[in-house]
């Protein structure tokens, strides 16, 4: 006879059968306390209604309590990245406990069928939930949901269907087939926790986006934009992780969202930061380095509860591994040109010297185009904390060796042999400072030498307090 | 102590069926997945699959699907490993090996094996 | 599905001496700072035994003259003194992803 389970009645692997052999058929869902940070121990397995695992295995009921929801699978094993989000939690919160919810079963499917068995998994988390309230000192608002993937969504229905409200969900990079644009309760959403946290590493616009696009949580977090994650292009992932395949870019993209999440675990000295804004171009541009209001905020995590903000989508650069944390800088550089220089757009670097260490050689990337005559904002980042900025270097490495630039340079010269070489006036350059909301403004050393051209490099120095233009025929006063 | 104790030796002929039983001792049958993996007369070691033994799910390898069924009796600890339609290659030493769900996944625990020879 | 080569085939030793024996994956079989790779010994008519596992760590019960090294996709197990018992057929395994493999194993035999 069927064993009823939830709501939902039995659940069965619709891609194996069970054996006529077996004497019994389980619940597809079960619940592993890990006892241990040594990922060989096989922990203690939870289930409603029993009291003595809770006793045997030293649950505590007044610790924070952490349940770890995998996502689809196409081997039917734990993958690899389980055991160091459970280690990195164990070592973080030493008193805690970790429960990883294996669904195995019901995701080692179809992926359709997989998405069809998340809201009776997510019956089942809320099932234990409701059990553990019974118990004296256990509190709903101690619970930490954390889902990756199809996993998420499973959080968002438990979150749902719980009696009480559970103080947060993290959304490692939710699915998006089937979830992108899906009604709120079919989905996760920032009504299914106190907090709703969330980390988006593969998001595309165009072809399958693995990871959802739309902002589900109450802070939604888009490192490198949500979609290319450095370290994980053919390149990379040929010489590292496993065979560099289509397929492992994309794993390595979509579980980046866990490895970010494991590094804001155990590199609490390092925290990583991000930056509300409207949209990706936007934080490209380096318009949103702003912590007023609480546009600012630690990922993973280390973020602080923001519940009066929905759907605030944040973003931040990371380096390729970990440490992931870099360090945010907005340029805002005037920009005065004398004659016109046709549409080329100027390939400019700049190298920032601080009193810890100096940077690489940094592209300001041009996101749309250079305006003339005008301040335009960049956003360049460091691996290293370079400290107090000193003085900075600008270089100008010539045109971009696009056709497009090429035939304009060619062009530009036919209409105008006699033309002068490209100029570009730079006085000042005004730095700001991600992490430490600093600003500093940096002037070129000699007022009256602040041009530059293709292959030319300019030097700013900490203006002076106080510093004033003196030459009042100057076409730079009043310009930055 | 954890054991793993496989059935006997069996010699059958081309066409037949084999099931082949391994009972496990000394721990939680359902914490661990049991592997199967067959060794060919001076051959190496060739994994062959696994069974969830909560669930009860199993998993073939590529040249493993088809004639044999893996299954559980979890009354008895006990899990199964049949080869339908044998054919004189599937002469080997069957072996049942336990991994844990978590962690690195190899294979601690071992049964002894049991020889299968198919012949006419 | 992740290949595993084993070399030598065949590595003849005195009692006594030290035996190195290699394995090689065709990809990385890390994750992270941990690797997937684990040794068995299997003597005649025996089933395989556990030796070592995740590249070094010594399974319960191994004496400690057996020891692991490497990391990536090469890997070498090391009997420092070869002992009597120690003559018998050694396999590399990877389990980072499914299906595990084994490698072809290295035979330790009496020179």
């Known amino acids: 006879s069927p064993v009823p389970f939830g709501p939902e009645g039995r659940l069965e692997d619709k891609l194996h059968k069970p054996k006529a052999t077996q004497t019994e058929v389980k619940p597809s869902v079960r619940f592993n306390l890990r006892t241990s940070k040594d990922p060989e121990h096989e922990g203690c397995y939870l289930s409603v209604g029993h009291s003595q695992p809770l006793e045997d295995c030293s649950f505590n009921m007044t610790a924070k309590t952490f349940f770890i929801i995998h996502g689809w699978t196409m081997s039917g094993i734990f993958e690899n990245w389980l055991h160091k989000l459970v280690s990195a939690l164990h070592t973080r919160e030493k008193d805690a406990n970790v429960v990883v919810v294996d669904w195995l079963p019901l995701a080692h499917q179809l992926y359709t069928d997989a998405v069809n068995n998340t809201r009776v998994v997510g019956h089942s988390i809320a099932r234990m939930l409701d059990w553990l309230q019974e118990k004296d000192d256990f509190s709903l608002g101690n619970v930490h949901l954390i889902g990756y993937s199809l996993g998420a969504h499973v959080a968002g229905y438990a979150g749902n269907f719980v009696k009480g409200t559970v103080g947060r969900i993290t959304g490692l990079d939710p699915a998006g087939p089937m979830f992108e644009g899906a009604d709120i309760h079919k989905r996760l959403s920032p009504d299914d926790a106190d907090f709703v946290d969330v980390l988006h590493t593969y998001t595309r616009s165009f072809g399958l986006s693995i990871g959802i696009q739309m902002p589900v949580g109450h802070i939604d977090i888009y490192p490198n934009g949500g979609d290319f994650q450095p370290g994980c292009g053919l390149n990379d992932v040929l010489g590292s992780i496993a065979y560099g395949t289509i397929t492992e870019v994309v794993k390595c993209e979509h579980e980046r969202a866990v490895h970010l999440f494991v590094d804001s675990l155990v590199n609490q000295d390092k925290p990583s930061f991000a930056f509300q804004c409207t949209d990706s171009n936007r934080f490209k541009k380096g318009i949103c380095l702003s912590c007023r209001k609480n546009r600012c905020n630690n990922i993973g995590y280390n973020a602080k509860k923001m519940r009066k903000k929905r759907n605030s989508k944040m973003y931040l650069k990371t380096r390729a591994g970990m440490p992931f944390k870099v360090y945010h800088y907005q340029l805002k550089v005037h920009m005065f040109s004398y004659n016109n220089s046709g549409d080329t757009q100027p390939t400019l670097y700049i190298t920032l010297y601080g009193s810890n260490a100096d940077s690489q050689n940094l592209p300001l990337e041009i996101v749309e185009k250079i305006e003339l005559n005008a301040t335009n904002t960049f956003l360049v980042y460091t691996e290293e904390d370079l400290g107090d900025l000193l003085k900075m270097r600008l270089t100008w490495e010539g045109v971009a060796h696009s056709w497009y630039n090429l035939w304009n340079e060619f062009r530009n010269y036919l209409s105008q042999p006699s033309n002068p070489s490209r100029e570009l006036y730079i006085r000042r350059i005004r730095v700001k400072s991600g992490e430490t909301q600093r600003k500093v403004t940096f002037c070129t050393q000699d007022p009256t030498k602040s041009s530059i051209s293709p292959g030319q490099e300019l030097w700013f120095h900490k203006c002076q307090d106080g510093w004033k233009m003196k030459n009042k025929t100057s076409p730079f006063v009043n310009l930055a | 102590q954890v054991q793993l104790v496989q059935s006997g030796a069996e010699v059958k002929k081309p066409g037949a069926s084999v099931k082949v039983s391994c009972k496990a001792s000394g721990y939680t049958f359902t914490n661990y997945g049991m592997n199967w993996v067959r060794q060919a007369p001076g051959q190496g070691l060739e994994w062959m699959g696994w069974?969830?033994?909560?669930?009860?799910?199993?998993t073939y390898a590529g040249d493993f699907k088809g004639r044999f069924t893996f299954t559980l009796d979890t009354s008895t600890s006990t899990a199964y490993m049949e080869l339908s339609s044998l054919r004189s290659e599937d002469t080997a030493v069957y072996y049942c090996a336990r991994r844990g769900y978590y962690g690195r996944r190899y294979f601690d625990v071992w049964g002894k094996g049991t020889t299968v020879t198919v012949s006419s | 599905e992740i290949v595993m080569t084993q070399s030598p085939a065949t590595l003849s030793v005195s009692p006594g001496e030290r035996a190195t024996l290699s394995c090689k994956a065709s990809q990385s079989v890390d994750y992270d700072v941990d690797s997937y790779m684990h040794w068995y010994q299997q003597k005649p008519g025996q089933a395989p035994r556990l030796l070592i596992y995740a590249a070094s760590n010594l399974a319960s019960g191994i004496p400690a003259r057996f020891s692991g090294s490497g990391s990536g996709t090469e890997f070498t197990l090391t009997i420092s003194s070869l002992q009597s018992e120690d003559f018998a057929v050694y396999y590399c395994q990877q389990t980072i992803e499914d299906p595990p493999t084994f490698g072809g194993g290295t035979k330790v035999e009496i020179k």
């Open positions: 069974i969830n033994t909560y669930s009860g799910v199993p």
